[in-house]
């Protein structure tokens, strides 16, 4: 690439070569700059899987890929038999965690991911094609949602048991791979910009650097590296009841997260199941899967069982049940 970018001083270029090489020299930095900019765009991912050891149990993982701090996470699902959507859990980094049946255990895994386990039986249990949605809010930047459902191939009715672990590894590799490519691209863009700045302009093809290039140098790599660092997880387990849910257009989720359809679905409304009794969240754990959580020490603090998992300056009021529509 270096030899292509420079036109030899003593040798005239071949016809058409000058334009082609100059064009490549100018286009490549813009492509890389675009990648760097998009690397900083917040994304939400969702993974739904069924436990191989317990076919009545699902695992849903949600995470936020972005640089902002999370102010609230809401997990919802479409409900059985086409019923209207229902909130399963709400996680606030300071005010605590609230959850409703069939949710059994909601918790933070990292600063940017949560986990939720659902009851394995009961009339309100979700089905294999139930859609789960995770919405991450980062105040005041905004909020982002992604939805997912269990892949059809993992249907418990099938003879072959699901194999979630390889899928998870593949998705993880995809995320890390793309992040790595973006990071490398940004570094390479910096290298190109530095070369354009320090080397003498080619005699036949003067180099033109964009006025926006220095700004890209300043922040794009850090955005990419941040995106590479955020590979969070969240988990949900549930049992299955038949439900027919139509999918609509995606609102978010990394395109490389291919283990399941991420989509947001607009569904016909029916009676929503309003479970008014919150189930206390259990003690927390630190996932060290694949060594991803080296930054576990930065997560919100966890305490033992109870409704409010974080210190609440307002006292016992936080322990009361919901006063409103739930």
């Amino acid at each position: 690439m270096r030899t292509e970018a420079q036109v030899p001083a003593l040798q005239p270029p071949e016809p058409g070569l000058e334009g082609a090489m100059g064009h490549r020299t100018l286009v490549l930095p813009w492509v890389l700059l675009t990648l760097c900019v998009t690397a900083g765009t917040p994304e939400v991912w969702v993974q739904v899987r069924m436990e191989a050891t317990e076919l009545s149990s699902f695992t849903i993982r949600c995470g936020f890929l972005g640089s902002g701090s999370i102010s609230l996470v809401t997990v919802s699902w479409g409900g059985p038999n086409g019923a209207g959507g229902t909130t399963l859990a709400v996680l606030h980094p300071e005010r605590g965690i609230r959850q409703w049946a069939p949710a059994r255990q909601a918790r933070w895994e990292t600063q940017s991911s949560i986990s939720l386990i659902l009851e394995g039986s009961g009339a309100s249990s979700p089905c294999a094609n139930t859609t789960f949605c995770c919405k991450f809010a980062s105040f005041p930047e905004g909020s982002w949602e992604a939805c997912g459902s269990l892949p059809p191939s993992s249907d418990p009715g099938l003879s072959a048991p699901p194999t979630p672990a390889p899928i998870l590894r593949a998705d993880l590799a995809g995320i890390l791979g793309v992040s790595g490519v973006l990071l490398f691209g940004c570094v390479y863009l910096l290298h190109l910009l530095r070369r354009h700045k320090h080397r003498p302009a080619p005699r036949l093809q003067p180099s033109r650097t964009s006025p926006q290039a220095p700004r890209a140098r300043a922040w794009a790599p850090s955005q990419a590296s941040q995106a590479a660092l955020h590979v969070p997880y969240a988990t949900i387990n549930t049992s299955c009841r038949p439900a027919t849910l139509d999918t609509a257009h995606p609102h978010g989720g990394p395109s490389w997260w291919a283990s399941l359809p991420t989509h947001a679905a607009h569904r016909p409304q029916g009676p929503a199941a309003w479970a008014s009794t919150p189930i206390p969240a259990r003690g927390s754990f630190v996932s060290v899967e694949n060594g991803l959580y080296a930054q576990a020490g930065e997560r919100p603090p966890h305490t033992g069982p109870g409704l409010t998992l974080f210190p609440d300056p307002r006292g016992p009021r936080a322990m009361e049940g919901p006063l409103g529509v739930r």
Partner: nanobody, 127 residues
Amino acid sequence: EVQLVESGGGLVQPGGSLRLSCAASGFTFSYYDMSWVRQAPGKGLEWVSTINSDGGRTSYVDSVKGRFTISRDNSKNTLYLQMNSLRAEDTAVYYCVEGDPHNFGLENLSLRDFGSWGQGTMVTVSS
């Protein structure tokens, strides 16, 4: 990205009516409880009303009961607040938010306590 855009605010005389709308996009609107909160000049954020995901249940702060009606149209991804018999004390910026503030208590409410929020629409009740 999630977007909530309020409209319908304005200047109205005491006893008058207004209908606020909130257009939602970027998320599965029908899955979430929605609320209206307001902030009067120089005051903190106050919860006004909440409606559940399918519109079957509603609740209101005492000061607006019988005067305000919250509703939603999930087919249009829109939340509404019909405000009748308006009073001077209803003057505030009204925000459309996702979530139920009762989840964590109504004290010291902040927009950061909700899953999504709009930019707000000003309602002024004055003669």
